[in-house]
């Protein structure tokens, strides 16, 4: 189960994101910062700092619009 305000690294980070985002999927950097996705992003924010549910959800992809 997800525990708020903790660091999440490794496989645990991937598994937690899959749980939080569900069918939406996710990306490891927010769309606005794709240029620097390898120098910032969720690994830095959640693994080396700390992260909560609200922050995790900002990395969930936007669901595709159904026609």
């Amino acid at each position: 189960a997800y525990r708020p305000s903790e660091t999440l690294c490794g496989g645990e980070l991937v598994d937690t994101l899959q749980f939080v985002c569900g069918d939406r999927g996710f990306y490891f950097s927010r769309p606005a910062s794709r240029v620097s996705r390898r120098s910032r992003g969720i690994v830095e924010e959640c693994c080396f700092r700390s992260c909560d549910l609200a922050l995790l959800e900002t990395y969930c992809a936007t669901p595709a619009k159904s026609e």
Partner: antibody, heavy 126, light 107 residues
Framework: EVQLLESGGGLVQPGGSLRLSCAAS????????MSWVRQAPGKGLEWVSS????????KYTDSVKGRFTISRDNSKNTLYLQMNSLRAEDTAVYYC???????????????????WGRGTLVTVSS | DIQMTQSPSTLSASVGDRVTITCRAS??????LAWYQQKPGKAPKLLIY???SLESGVPSRFSGSGSGTEFTLTISSLQPDDFATYYC?????????FGQGTKVEIK
């Protein structure tokens, strides 16, 4: 050639200090988390420390917290381990290792160590 | 911390034997497990990652399986080059931890 090469090991007295270096080549060093893993003589592997790709964030195993400092210089493709207040139980071969792996779109998806250096021996003894 | 326990500690086998090494985690690590081979005086070499994915260049006689807390490394037909020590490692969460190792020696 993709490789890691450690240096800086040697004999040091208890309480002393040593600085290890790991020179990386053949890959974009600045994009990868790097780690130190050690192995005491005749013993198994023990993860020591990791540092984020940009260098700003670090992790340590409990037994070295406050004594060891991991750092990196991405302009020199080099990883460091500053070891202070050394103890006999720190005697080991120290390996640097490359971790965090990206998929084709640049997303970090895995954290195993796919590249290791040959190691440098640190002996703490009076 | 997640404890990793390997069995057996030592395994005596002959060339051509099928060899199985077990690794158990103290809590679930999903499939976030790697296997390494180490020979005396050498650095570890990655064999398997994500429990069952074979690293590029590693012979197909090596295979990994398992998920959750129990994992196995299998060598389908032991070759002279395979006598070494094998370690499992979890990377589900920090601190990364290794099993104590399994030495595969000549019978």
């Amino acid at each position: 050639e993709v490789q890691l090469l450690e240096s800086g090991g040697g004999l040091v007295q208890p309480g002393g200090s040593l600085r290890l270096s790991c020179a990386a080549s053949g890959f974009t060093f600045s994009e990868y988390e790097m780690s130190w893993v050690r192995q005491a003589p005749g013993k198994g592997l023990e993860w020591v420390s990791s540092i984020y790709s940009s260098g700003g964030w670090t992790k340590y195993t409990d037994s070295v917290k406050g004594r060891f400092t991991i750092s990196r210089d991405n302009s020199k493709n080099t990883l460091y381990l500053q070891m202070n207040s050394l103890r006999a139980e720190d005697t080991a071969v120290y390996y640097c290792a490359k971790g965090v792996h990206y998929d084709s779109s640049g997303l970090p998806i895995d954290w195993y160590f796919d590249l290791w250096g040959r190691g440098t021996l640190v002996t703490v003894s009076s | 911390d997640i404890q990793m326990t390997q069995s057996p500690s030592t395994l005596s086998a002959s060339v051509g034997d099928r060899v199985t090494i077990t690794c158990r985690a103290s809590q679930s690590i999903s499939s976030w497990l790697a296997w390494y081979q180490q020979k005396p005086g050498k650095a570890p070499k990655l064999l398997i990652y994500k429990a069952s994915s074979l690293e590029s260049g590693v012979p197909s006689r090596f295979s990994g399986s398992g998920s959750g807390t129990e994992f196995t490394l299998t060598i389908s037909s032991l070759q002279p080059d395979d006598f070494a020590t094998y370690y499992c490692q979890q990377y589900n969460s920090y601190p990364w931890t290794f099993g104590q190792g399994t030495k595969v020696e000549i019978k």
